[in-house]
């Protein structure tokens, strides 16, 4: 898969990244930048809802590492701890959302690293004619929900959010120009894993089924 | 159970050295544990110096780094103190103790064993 | 390093009667604190850790309580043995640090 970048990254005042990772990439996530002769112990504390929270720890002293409540197979140190501190998501899954939290013991204090990962899922964009002058846009199984606009603007029906059990989203505008003498409108989809515009043809006649929609991006 | 007990000189002049003993009985300092030494000066203020771990690796309090030293003899399941260029504000009572790291090695840094401890003065 | 703050320094009572200590950190400590009873003659002894834990062999009447930076350890129906010096002790973080010591003496 891709190596996810940090390019959405954003630090809170109490030193906590809010970290969107796109779903199926992978992740790295840091420690603080402590230098290793000054350690005495590393833990990774992972905080899923709905799960035990679990530790992954490291014992420089005398090189030991310890588990406690974890089962995800894919969130492992990047590589052996006294190598590497950074832990890796491969790949990247819906349920890993969580707040992840790299915690540094010093003799000197401790020093601390938190994010919160929210998985990105790229929602799948679909557009059609469903009747004379209306056209319908779909933004399916998106994390987080999508927006839609329209340019031109027509008259639209309230935008419906349909939430599924996985944590996604699947977003539907329905417009009408009944009274617009636009030929092609365009459905614009807002989303964090980046944005995506398809254009139709509007038939003034009987109602079509599925006039297939062109792609802008 | 496990028992500590410090030994020491009791009376240091200014400006030497001294080395502080103690002794586990119950248990092997080779096994486990955190092994620490702590002092609680004249008036009650306590402070922790820094401690020696089963492996062998030591962790010192960074206020006093340069001036102190914790070893350890495992033939004779003993563990020692060595402060350098001590002067009068050194005099206390020294404890040596014992910590356990929990699962996480975070945190579970408090003393469920002590010994009960050595007076050492330091005047001329 | 954490600075910690106990207090009172001395504390009069009567058997029979119940008492409190606060201890303070100077920064969030979460719930890592523990209280100590110091007696002439004994080895120190570990009353409670993790803020409210009782170690094994601590009788019921102690009690800990707090979190964040505010911590109370409160003695319920005093026995005479409970006269001592009780200290509080941050384990959240090296260097470890102790508050400057209680004494509780007879009424």
């Known amino acids: 898969g891709k190596q996810m970048t940090q390019n959405y990254s954003k630090m809170s005042a109490e030193g906590n990244i809010s970290q969107p990772v796109l779903m199926d990439t992978n992740a790295n996530l840091c420690c603080p930048p402590i230098e290793f002769r000054n350690l005495i112990v590393i833990v990774w504390e992972i905080i899923i809802r709905g799960q035990p929270s679990c530790t992954k720890a490291y014992r420089k002293e005398t090189n030991e590492t310890k588990e406690t409540n974890c089962t995800d197979k894919r969130i492992t140190w990047v590589s052996t701890p006294d190598q590497n501190s950074d832990l890796q998501i491969h790949p990247v899954a819906i349920t890993h959302d969580g707040y992840y939290r790299c915690i540094m013991a010093t003799p000197d204090g401790n020093f601390h690293r938190g994010y919160h990962l929210q998985v990105l899922v790229t929602p799948e964009v679909t557009l059609f004619q469903s009747r004379n002058r209306t056209a319908v846009c779909k933004a399916v199984a998106g994390k987080p929900a999508a927006q839609i606009s329209w340019i031109p603007a027509g008259d639209c029906a309230p935008t419906e959010h349909e939430y599924w059990g996985n944590g996604t989203v699947t977003v539907e505008s329905m417009c009408h120009w009944g009274d617009h003498n636009a030929s092609t409108v365009t459905c614009h989809v807002s989303h964090l894993t980046g944005n995506k515009s398809l254009y139709i043809k509007l038939n003034s006649g009987l109602r079509t089924s599925g006039s297939p929609a062109l792609d802008l991006l | 159970e496990i028992q500590l007990q410090e030994s020491g000189p009791g009376l240091v002049k200014p400006s030497q050295s001294f080395s502080l003993t103690c002794s586990v009985t119950g248990y092997t300092i080779t096994s486990g544990y955190d092994w620490s030494w702590i002092r609680k000066f004249p008036g009650n203020r306590m402070e922790w110096m820094g401690y020696i771990n089963y492996s062998g690796s030591t962790v010192y309090n960074p206020s006093l780094r340069s001036r102190f030293s914790i070893t350890r003899d495992t033939s004779k399941n003993q563990f020692f103190l060595q402060l350098n260029s001590v002067a009068s504000e050194d005099t206390a009572t020294y404890y040596c103790?014992?910590?356990?790291?929990?699962?996480?090695?975070?945190?579970?840094?408090?003393?469920?064993?002590w010994g009960p401890g050595t007076m050492v003065t330091v005047s001329s | 390093d954490v600075q910690m703050t106990q207090s009172p320094s001395y504390l009069a009572a009567s058997p029979g009667e119940s008492v409190s200590i606060s201890c303070k950190a100077g920064?969030?400590?979460?719930?890592?604190l523990a209280w100590y009873q110091a007696k002439p003659g004994k080895t120190n002894k570990v009353l409670i850790h993790?803020?409210?834990t009782l170690q094994s062999g601590t009788p019921s009447r102690f009690s800990g309580s707090g979190f964040g930076t505010d911590f109370t350890l409160t003695i319920r129906s005093l026995e005479p043995e409970d006269f001592a010096v009780y200290y509080c002790q941050q384990h959240n973080e090296f260097p470890l640090t102790f508050g400057s010591g209680t004494k509780l003496e007879i009424k």
């Open positions: 920064k969030n400590i979460n719930t890592n």
């Open positions: 103790a014992k910590f356990e790291a929990s699962n996480t090695y975070l945190y579970d840094w408090y003393f469920d064993f």
């Open positions: 993790s803020g409210s």
